[in-house]
Amino acid sequence: PEPPTACREKQYLINSQCCSLCQPGQKLVSDCTEFTETECLPCGESEFLDTWNRETHCHQHKYCDPNLGLRVQQKGTSETDTICTCEEGWHCTSEACESCVLHRSCSPGFGVKQIATGVSDTICEPCPVGFFSNVSSAFEKCHPWTSCETKDLVVQQAGTNKTDVVCGPQDRLRA
């Protein structure tokens, strides 16, 4: 018969014949022959392969180094790599999450639009007219100016994006 030029899914072509790929969690020891099946071996502890493969070496699990602010989000297995994330108050510097940086704080005059997560930084926004923030914070949103009217008071000092309005008593009309 004609030697194959393509193989089925989960097979690979070698020496003009189709051999079975090794399943996830196993590496290739020897290719199949006319008389023998593909020989595969399980990955060692702290190693993995996450696809049907013909790799002769397993990949090492990622190390979530606590000294870089990392912690384990999902423990590695023979079929999956370890997934790292950052400690509370920190976020990954890249998609691969190889190190962490402290969450950014929003300066006075800016409020938090979106609180940071283990993988994304704080998103700040300028406080619009009618709102203020007088602190540097990774959590605080812009606060609305105090409504003097609802307290039967009047504005004595206008608010800014960094300060609240100052309310005071209404001037009494002299008789």
């Epitope: 502890e45 699990h61 384990v72 023979s78 079929e79 999956t80």
Partner: antibody, heavy 119, light 113 residues
């Protein structure tokens, strides 16, 4: 037959140090990750530390971080736990347990060694 | 950290009966890569070290009798012992094997009626 034998337990004063050992036999020690797990008298189980087969990956429980050090000597088929700045709450039976590269579970446990921290 | 909550804390049982105990985790134990739930059960008899009973939620360790059955997914898990034997009297611990720190439930103790 898989065997894990802990030693080094005993009475220690608060602030003191102790080194626990776990001698492994009946399997290829260098192929397995290893854990220390402790159990306070009459209480449940608490994971303490893990070291990967090749020494590359080490994780600790927050309760012992900075005070305890896990290590291994594959040539001697031995696992160690160096415990410094010991506190009364560290009093427990300390077990070593192995983790294989298939289940990723603690599949064999030693008999344990008791560490008592008291003045 | 993942909190493992077991109930009941103790059960008074008789030989031959069917026993069910629950374990809940504070977050999912499902590995997104291989779709396995990394929930482990250990059995600890008085004066002995723990012994691996079930891993991946429902896979019995070699030598464990088939009267032990693990089930569940995500955050809710169950260990069932059918036709309970006297030698099954022990404390059963569920364990998060999904992430570090590894965490255990407080245990369910089986006592003879």
């Amino acid at each position: 037959e898989v065997q894990l034998v802990e030693s080094g337990g005993g009475l220690v004063k608060p602030g003191g140090s102790r080194r626990l050992s776990c001698a492994a036999s009946g399997f290829t020690f260098s192929d397995y990750g290893m854990h220390w797990v402790r159990q306070a008298p009459g209480k449940g189980l608490e994971w303490v530390a893990y070291i990967s087969s090749g020494n590359r990956i080490i994780y600790y429980a927050d309760t012992v971080k900075g005070r305890f050090t896990i290590s291994r000597d594959n040539a001697k088929n031995s696992l160690y736990l160096q415990m410094n700045s010991l506190r009364a709450e560290d009093t427990a039976v300390y077990y070593c347990a192995r983790q294989d590269g298939y289940r990723y579970a603690m599949d064999y446990w030693g008999q344990g060694t008791l560490v008592t921290v008291s003045s | 950290d993942i909190v493992m909550t077991q109930s009941p804390s103790s059960l008074t049982v008789t030989a031959g009966e069917k026993v069910t105990m629950s374990c809940k985790s504070s977050q999912s134990l499902l590995n997104s890569g291989n779709q396995k739930n990394y929930l482990t059960w250990h059995q600890q008899k008085p004066g002995q070290p723990p012994k691996l009973l079930i891993y991946w939620t429902s896979t019995r360790e070699s030598g464990v009798p088939d009267r032990f059955t693990g089930s569940g997914s995500g955050t809710d898990f169950t260990l069932t012992i059918s036709n309970l034997q006297a030698e099954d009297l022990a404390v059963y611990y569920c364990q998060n094997d999904y992430t570090y720190p590894l965490t255990f439930g407080a245990g369910t103790k089986l006592e003879l009626k």
